[in-house]
């Protein structure tokens, strides 16, 4: 099959998808399209994970390219190593793999590159400009466990027709990601849906076991369920729902308690209506109906900002008066131009090389702004109670399967995204130091729970998920702003959510977040225009639930290839790269662990809500970070405060001046 | 090595069609996009549309949407651009141009070959 | 769209002299900026891509260099061969190209 048709195409193995979206797409764009279904630019770092790419993505032409997600800052060649001096969008730079259609050659590397992988021949890596917009991208998509195919019966009018929570649709799959449906039709009746679903006995499987289209009792025609069928002992047929359904009245078919959309923003099963209604971050329950959600006015709270702020519907700004700027950490303000200095020195003088021309000088900025930062966020607490979230996956997605991307324009990502589903590689970082700045205060105990390990599927619903405050560390809790949760008790001290401190951004070398420069946007614009943040712009969080009903999508059926990979241990002292390079086909490189020296620790810019960047949750074990790609800079007058989610208790300033009518693109990171 | 050689040049009276040609050689036509490009006397340079030959695949610049129509041979290696309606500001220089996929390791979308072009004159 | 000004328009250099040529774009184009030589009666050639990287066959006396919003274009020692004119082409919303107004490069 052509992978350049319209339709997007995936090839699954045990434990990880990889689909080829074919889309002309920035670097970021595509960054973005992954992210929103749950999954992340392909990290082909193995031998079998680029096997697996090289079976998906066939032989296409050569005039066309995918991106993968590996990029370089300005001035970061190390061209002695694998990725030289790439890193992978997940956040480090641990590969047994390597593709470069050229060897190294050396060079000054003076701006920043991304990596698109060729769609014919040997499929090697290019390196080139970030916002040029390819011909397609490829997403990976990993979780804890997978389904395999179901096996076809007898009584079957047709293949089982599945459909994947990143909005694949194919009957074609070997194995299904946990939270797949499998939609069965039988000769003899209406057949069956089948969920991808966590087994109490641990591992995953399919919800109920075969036959699907025989035996008495339930056949022919599933005894009139609509979901699932339960021959009594005593010969009778009764009909069940799967989790987060109820029987309707007639005793057969299945109802969704948040189909007819009663709540506002965010629906959950559960609850002794049926359903409970949630807020997203910045809003709260309205006092008279809780099944609206009424904004949160962060500007009441004493001390937010030093001199202005401005609140809008979801969120809100700081800005500094005429002949200031508003510093990194998006509150203080500081006489104009003295926070560029002070970030240069804060950076290291290596950035900035007296010897330099006066083109270098004028790279300064990107050589600044183009270092790592830690994007604090969200820890996922233990599973203590059920989530505070609506689990918004549904498996028929006529019209969201391609990414909901305004093109060009970039995406307008959830304001805060249920936990990611962990991306496990085969390639563990045994290497990099996590190194904490000294200079962020500590925060009471109590704000601090244990980090729990994010191996549990997204759709889990033994997952707890918090309730985020807006926690300003010198404010008592009582002016802390959060989501507040309609249906559920305040939670004991024992479980108490991690807070999110908007007040000291926590920079974290080793985990790195990719920056932008600035945007030219003038002051008098940003303060007079403040768009508020559309409520439908973006799509659902994508996380997997058990509650949606089980249907026969009425999407297009796409082909797709699958591959059986062995599991590779997650344990290696050192890393052996493979090299496909034309020049060494079996090169061999080991990676110790003394070669992954730290990034250096960057102040980060602030975004605006024209442009938000996708909080995110940890896609991979040995990196709770990924690397945000940006291609809007940073005003020193504005700063949005959003959440994101990283092992840490403080929260990030992602802000961008650019106004909602004039967004520019960059080559650089945020 | 690689050549693209354009049709020879063109006098049209305003309101007529011109179909322009482009033969390709010494590369895989269906590897590389063509690009066509508008060159008016004292004017810059201006992009007119592009053609895969794999798939055939067209985009045109607004501006010439509607006038313009590119096309592909594969088997003849050849693109072709054709001009209807003509109009008396149409006369210029036409080329085709060679998109180029990757140089030393870089992927980028600047041509890297050029025809020698095409002068089409519009006069009643 | 994406406008592209360079300047100078003309420019007059003696053999051996250093030659710069800006090019500005209306907005971030990044590094996805190329330069074209054009002689007379010819057709365009490729100078220069992805702003600071040199065509192969091009002598190293042609360099470029900028991202974002202004790039050059520099001959560090002007040959008589080099008569021409130069323009820059931006590319960052492929396939949407917008070029340069060209600058006209005559000897002394």
């Known amino acids: 099959q052509d992978p350049w048709a319209a339709e997007p195409r995936s090839a699954c193995g045990p434990s990880s998808c990889y689909a080829l979206f074919p889309r002309r797409r920035t670097f970021l764009e595509a960054w973005r399209a992954c992210r929103e279904l749950g999954g992340d630019l392909a990290t082909p770092r193995t031998p079998e994970e680029a096997q697996r790419v090289d079976n998906l993505v066939g032989a296409g032409p050569a005039s066309r390219l995918l991106w993968i997600g590996l990029q370089r800052q300005a001035r970061q060649c190390q061209l002695q190593r694998p990725l030289r001096g790439f890193t992978w969008t997940t956040g480090d730079q641990d590969t047994a793999f390597t593709n470069w259609a050229q060897p190294a050659t050396g060079g000054p590397c003076p701006a920043q590159r991304c990596v698109a992988l060729e769609a014919s021949g040997e499929h090697r890596w290019l390196e080139g400009s970030c916002t040029l917009a390819v011909d397609g991208y490829l997403c990976q998509f990993g979780f804890e466990g997978a389904c395999p195919a179901l096996q076809d019966e007898a009584g079957q009018a047709g293949p089982a027709v599945y459909t994947t929570p990143f909005h694949l649709v194919s009957t074609e799959f070997e194995w299904l990601p946990f939270g797949s449906v499998a939609a069965v039709q039988c000769q003899a009746g209406r057949g069956a849906s089948l969920l991808c679903v966590k087994q109490p006995e641990g591992g995953v499987g399919w919800s109920r076991a075969g036959p699907l289209c025989l035996g008495a009792g339930c056949s022919p025609d599933n005894g009139g369920c609509e979901h699932e069928c339960v021959e009594e002992v005593d010969g009778h047929v009764s009909c069940r729902c799967t989790e987060g359904f109820r029987l309707a009245a007639d005793g057969r078919s299945c109802e969704d308690p948040c189909a007819q959309a009663p709540c506002e923003q965010q629906c959950e099963p559960g609850g002794p209506q049926g359903y409970s209604c949630h807020c997203r971050l910045g809003f709260r329950p309205a006092e008279d109906d809780p099944h609206r959600c009424v904004d949160t006015d962060e500007c009441q709270i004493a001390g937010v900002c030093q001199q202005m702020c401005v609140n809008y519907v979801g969120g809100f700004e700081c800005y500094c008066s005429e002949g200031h700027e508003l510093e990194a950490d998006g509150i203080s303000c500081s006489p104009a131009g003295a926070m560029g200095a002070r970030a240069s020195q804060d950076l290291g003088d290596e950035l900035l090389d007296d010897g330099e021309d006066e083109e270098d000088e004028d790279e300064a900025w990107e050589a600044f702004g183009g270092g790592w930062t830690e994007m604090p966020g969200i820890l996922w607490m233990e599973p203590t109670q059920p989530p505070d979230f609506a689990l918004a996956y549904r498996p028929s997605f006529p019209e969201d399967r391609e990414p909901q991307i305004p093109y060009p324009e970039p995406t307008w990502p959830p304001p805060l995204s249920a936990p990611r589903v962990p991306y496990h590689s085969s390639v563990l970082s045994v290497t990099r130091p996590v190194v904490v700045s000294a200079t962020r205060p500590t925060l009471p105990s109590a704000h601090q729970p244990p980090v729990i390990p994010a191996t549990h599927p997204a759709l889990s619903r033994d997952h707890q998920i918090p309730v985020i405050a807006a926690n300003y560390p010198d404010l008592p809790s009582a002016y802390q702003p959060g989501i507040l949760s309609v249906s559920h008790p305040a939670q004991p001290p024992a479980h108490q959510p991690p807070m999110i401190s908007t007040r000291y951004p926590e920079l974290f070398p080793a985990h790195q977040s990719p920056m932008f420069p600035d945007t030219q946007v003038a002051g008098t614009q940003t303060t007079t225009h403040l768009p508020a943040i559309p409520p439908n712009r973006a799509p659902l969080v994508t996380t997997l639930g058990a509650h949606q009903p089980p249907q026969a999508p009425d999407a297009p059926v796409l082909r797709t290839q699958a591959t059986q990979l062995p599991i590779i241990p997650t344990a290696q002292p050192s890393l052996t790269t493979s090299s496909r390079s034309p020049v060494s086909p079996a090169h061999q490189v080991s990676v110790p662990a003394a070669t992954q020296p730290p990034a250096l620790p960057t102040l980060l810019p602030s975004q605006s809500p024209t442009n938000q960047t996708s909080p995110i949750s940890p896609t991979h074990p040995h990196s709770k970070v990924p690397q945000i790609p940006r291609e809007d800079g940073p005003s020193p007058k504005l700063a949005l405060w959003l959440p994101s989610a990283a092992p840490t208790a403080a929260p990030t300033a992602l802000g961008e001046a650019s106004l909602a009518e004039h967004i520019q693109r960059d080559d650089r990171w945020l | 090595q690689v050549q693209l050689v354009q049709s020879g040049p063109e006098v049209k009276k305003p309101g007529a069609s011109v179909k322009l040609s482009c033969k390709a050689s010494?590369?895989?036509?269906?590897?590389?996009?063509i690009h066509w490009v508008k060159q008016a006397p004292g004017q810059r340079l201006e992009w007119m549309g592009y053609i895969n030959p794999y798939d055939d695949d067209t985009t045109y610049n607004q501006k010439f949407k509607g006038q313009v129509t590119i096309t592909v041979d594969t088997s003849a290696s050849t693109a072709y651009m054709e001009l209807n309606s003509l109009r008396s500001e149409d006369t210029a220089v036409y080329y085709c141009?060679?998109?180029?996929?990757?140089?030393?390791?870089?992927?980028?979308?600047?041509?890297?070959?050029w025809g020698q072009g095409t002068l089409v004159t519009v006069s009643s | 769209d994406i406008q592209l000004t360079q300047s100078p328009s003309f420019l007059s250099a003696s053999v051996g002299d250093r030659v710069t040529i800006t090019c500005r774009a209306s907005?971030?184009?990044?590094?996805?900026v190329a330069w074209y030589q054009q002689k007379p009666g010819k057709a365009p050639k490729l100078l220069i891509y992805?702003?600071?990287n040199r065509y192969t066959g091009v002598p190293s006396r042609f360099s470029g260099s900028g991202s974002g919003t202004e790039f050059t274009l520099t001959i560090s020692s002007m040959q008589p061969e080099d008569l021409a004119t130069y323009f820059c082409q931006q590319y960052t919303n492929y396939p949407m190209y917008t070029f340069g107004q060209g600058t006209k490069l005559e000897i002394k």
């Open positions: 141009a060679r998109r180029g996929n990757s140089y030393d390791g870089y992927f980028d979308y600047s041509m890297d070959y």
């Open positions: 907005q971030n184009v990044g590094t996805a």
């Open positions: 992805s702003a600071s």
């Open positions: 010494g590369y895989t036509f269906t590897d590389y996009v």
